[in-house]
Interface confidence: low
Amino acid sequence: EEELQVIQPDKSVLVAAGETATLRCTATSLIPVGPIQWFRGAGPGRELIYNQKEGHFPRVTTVSDLTKRNNMDFSIRIGNITPADAGTYYCVKFRKGSPDDVEFKSGAGTELSVRAKPSAPVVSGPAARATPQHTVSFTCESHGFSPRDITLKWFKNGNELSDFQTNVDPVGESVSYSIHSTAKVVLTREDVHSQVICEVAHVTLQGDPLRGTANLSETIRVPPTLEVTQQPVRAENQVNVTCQVRKFYPQRLQLTWLENGNVSRTETASTVTENKDGTYNWMSWLLVNVSAHRDDVKLTCQVEHDGQPAVSKSHDLKVSAHPKEQGSNTAAENTGSNERNIY
């Protein structure tokens, strides 16, 4: 009888992660008697995948009933494939021996390639907030994909960015790969509602790329502009002075009124109005009893925004004559007062 041959008809098999790989193997003869074993890799460091004779291999099932003596089909199925399963698999016929079975003939091998989807891109921004006109870096990371070829793009509000650097690791062969990209973004005052998007395209995604996003609201700090105005007389000896704090983000803001340099009142912006661009406006007022002052009063609205050094705006209040309206409230539709004091 012709000597047994081990035939692995498939040089390569491509499987998507999570699916089942079928590795085909047939023998041309029923002799010699002995078990079939499957290995990944060759040489002394090869990894046993399945042993017909003994062992427990929960991920492996046989295509046919290997308990039957007349069986010559030694194909196996490996379930729940991951990138770590990639490699060349060998179907090896052993001859019964003593004290151990002896390797008799090996198949040519089947290369299992695993197509693994990249993980959802994770975009992270700078640790500290930055102000408009500054350039900030965003990183995008995605892991676990295979094959190595991958395309990464950056967008800001739908517009593709060009200032970025991307690396795919490792450089050599690997069961799976990771991508790391850093993009530079110039902030503008309108970026509170902006998003930076990292888009990853890969053969496993069938034209439907994965996206990771970062909201620039987590990154940007828009410093407020201040306007102090004197309102019409409320009562004979009282003047209402308002401090309009406009176009700031984030909301964390503390306002202090000073009369001639002395702290009069400190308050925290609680309920504010939101502009269409995502920035906030707030208004605080101070009722000044003019009769309590002999000389002119310098009123200062001092604002500490998001833990930054305070900015201030002053207003000189003339107390010599009856106060008249000095300036007007020119707040736009979204910049009305929103000091929700409980009266």
Epitope: T271, T273, E274, K276, M283, E333, N334, G336, S337, N338, E339, R340, N341, I342, Y343
Partner: antibody
């Protein structure tokens, strides 16, 4: 469709407790301030409570210390826990979304009736 | 608390009429004023916010105006479905407060 559905109303004795629920659907619940407003039969509207997106809460003096408001964003649900109930708390209670840029009310539930009586 | 006073408390008008309801705040509310319509047995419906902005789906026959402490709701041409009770509300400061309502009845 944006919808608010209140439940949990009923008859309770003075001094008793009741918990109202409001199930929200059709919008990103966690992004909105949510309010409770009540209306006694034949009377006007009275604002009862608000809970902001950050969990901050406010109450008028009439219910302060007796009512608590809470939200469970994962379940798109708003709650009003009413303790030490009085006859004056008898009303239809509405769940309302503060839906505009300035927290103006835009969506109202159908209301649930609370009767406090011995 | 900020008091909201509506006038008149009730109003009789005919279909096709133009009607105006006024609302006065006890102090400035920075234009955080809303108007609501309520029909018997129903939940209120939001009509107007920040004095003059129409809520989505509200017909343009409703209009709001005013500033400071005095505000008005105008219905340009009354239709049968417009007969209801109307409330103003300030939402400038907590506690938010409503006017006592204006009942609009068919003459």
């Amino acid at each position: 469709e944006v919808q608010l559905v209140e439940s949990g109303g009923g008859l309770v004795q003075p001094g008793g407790s009741l918990r109202l629920s409001c199930a929200a659907s059709g919008f990103t619940f966690s992004s909105y301030d949510m309010h409770w407003v009540r209306q006694a039969t034949g009377k006007g509207l009275e604002w009862v409570s608000v809970i902001g997106t950050a969990g901050d809460t406010y109450f008028p003096g009439s219910v302060k210390g007796r009512f608590t408001i809470s939200r469970e964003n994962a379940k798109n649900s708003l709650y009003l826990q009413m303790n030490s109930l009085r006859a004056g708390d008898t009303a239809v209670y509405y769940c309302v979304r503060g839906g505009n840029w300035d927290d103006a009310f835009d969506i109202w539930g159908q209301g649930t009736m609370v009767t406090v009586s011995s | 608390d900020i008091q909201m006073t509506q006038s008149p408390s009730s109003l009789s008008a005919s279909v096709g009429d133009r009607v105006t309801i006024t609302c006065r705040a006890s102090q400035g509310i920075n234009n955080y004023l809303a108007w609501f319509q309520q029909k018997p047995g129903k939940a209120p419906k939001s009509l107007i916010y920040t004095v003059s902005r129409l809520q989505s789906g509200v017909p343009s026959k409703f209009s709001g105006s005013g500033s400071g402490t005095d505000f008005t709701l105008t219905i340009s041409s009354l239709q049968p479905e417009d007969f209801a009770t109307y409330y103003c509300q300030q939402y400038n400061s907590y506690p938010y407060t409503f006017g006592q309502g204006t009942k609009l009845e068919i003459k």
